[in-house]
């Protein structure tokens, strides 16, 4: 199905406009901002979601140490250029002709330049590390219960194939979820780890992208998991290119 037929809405993306004008009167949904048709049986790409967001009215287990090449999205929101398939274009520019290169999750991976800046290809983010700090609880969560529930969440809510959830680490109060997905591993129809991570990030912040859902209620053996802080690290198949000036 492409959208909920009964009242013509998009279950997986509330930032859409839907109408029964598809083939045979079927419900068809288009993303705000771009007007692109979206498949409501799966997650919408992060690029289209960011574009829609910008168009909306402004109202003994060890934890993983992110590699030196890990990127954090420090630039915040911007109005991205998306390709016809909804992916980020490799080069992004703002209205003042400042340009930069991004990876497949839309995070800047070069210094900013002018219109002459070249971004030869869209570099894939193949490893995402989601670092969460949960609110103190009476006791630590059971690691295997936590692991199972987070894997179930990514499988059922975000429709991410289980093989792409590489690991769940836990050292109270820090939880780390590792998502890995190389270009060669991603088959047609597979949810992208970048899109799943973005939906999760918005859910955790109480800004669910799903239609008609108030927010994420994640429980481990009945105890709500309340996240106080989220950091997401992105690792690209090709290391980013920043000048030494930025690294000091």
């Amino acid at each position: 199905h492409t959208a909920a037929q009964d009242n013509c809405t998009c279950p997986t993306n509330k930032m859409t406009v839907c109408s029964p004008d598809g083939p045979g009167g079927r419900c068809q949904c288009r993303a705000l901002g771009s007007g692109m048709a979206v498949d409501c049986s799966t997650l919408t790409s992060k690029c289209l979601l960011l574009k829609a967001r910008m168009s909306a009215p402004k109202n003994a287990r060890t934890l993983v140490r992110p590699s030196e090449h890990a990127l954090v999205d420090n630039d915040g929101l911007y109005d991205p250029d998306c390709d016809p398939e909804g992916r980020f274009k490799a080069r992004q520019c703002n209205q003042t002709s400042v340009c930069w290169c991004v990876n497949s999750v839309g995070v800047r991976r070069t210094d900013k330049g002018d219109l002459s800046l070249r971004c030869d290809e869209l570099v894939r983010t193949h490893h995402i590390l989601i670092d969460l700090r949960h609110r103190p609880t009476a006791g630590a969560f059971n690691h295997s219960d936590l692991d199972a529930e987070l894997r179930r969440l990514f499988r059922e809510r975000y429709r991410l194939h289980p093989k792409f959830v590489a690991a769940v680490h836990y050292e109270q109060p820090t939880i780390q979820i590792e998502l890995r997905q190389n270009t060669s591993q991603k088959a047609a129809g597979d949810v992208d780890i970048g899109d799943a991570a973005y939906y999760f990030e918005r859910d955790i912040k109480g800004e669910s992208l799903f239609q008609g859902r108030g927010g994420l209620d994640l429980r481990v053996r009945g105890e709500p998991l309340q996240v106080e802080r989220t950091l997401i690290y992105y690792l690209d198949e090709i290391p980013p290119k920043f000048s030494m000036k930025r690294l000091t």
Epitope: I204, K205, F210, G214, V227
Partner: antibody, heavy 119, light 112 residues
Framework: QVQLQESGPGLVKPSETLSLTCTVS????????VNWIRQPPGKGLEWIGV???????NYNSALMSRLSISKDNSKSQVFLKMNSLQTDDTGMYYC?????????????WGQGTLVTVSS | DIVMTQSPSSLAVSLGERATMSCKSS????????????LAWYQQKPGQPPKLLIS???SRESGVPDRFSGSGSGTDFTLTISSVQAEDLAVYYC????????FGGGTKVEIK
Amino acid sequence: QVQLQESGPGLVKPSETLSLTCTVSGFSLTSYGVNWIRQPPGKGLEWIGVMWAGGSTNYNSALMSRLSISKDNSKSQVFLKMNSLQTDDTGMYYCARDENWDGAWFAYWGQGTLVTVSS
Amino acid sequence: DIVMTQSPSSLAVSLGERATMSCKSSQSLLNSGTRKNYLAWYQQKPGQPPKLLISWASSRESGVPDRFSGSGSGTDFTLTISSVQAEDLAVYYCKQSYNLFTFGGGTKVEIK
């Protein structure tokens, strides 16, 4: 469509064990939790316990020592066992679906089954 | 355990009048991360199972008339029926899901 149906004996003798079954359709027990709630005649609602989708359970602390909840995913059934029944256990027993990650709200309920504890 | 206290226990209102009922919890129901409250309101009519009206303290369920509204945060919550209709005759329960589940004692809405 989502449906829940409670079943079990209407009459139970004091000190005996109550066994109820909640049979569900329209969803999988591996994706949604099922709660048991009861209501004495003319009184309010009391949460009994829950069988989560992942297979773990939680119980009302006041009733925990007498309770056991289990399930059979393949048969789409959740079972409630409560022992050492007394007359004040009389009431309507409901099962209700938890809304998974959208919130622990009970959006779908069975019609309930009346349990009378009497000798 | 979290204790939920509802008041009044019964409320007699004329048709078209506003009805307001209160629910207080013994501890905060606010998730500081998502800024959402783990509180729901249910309506139970005679001889029927309860029906979910409001989730997350203020989110009206689909199909619920807009005369019903929920408000409040932390420990104090309110359910308001802006203009009571005959079909609103029922008992209204609040329920916390911050620490497992507890229902309030209920508020019975009667027609004057």
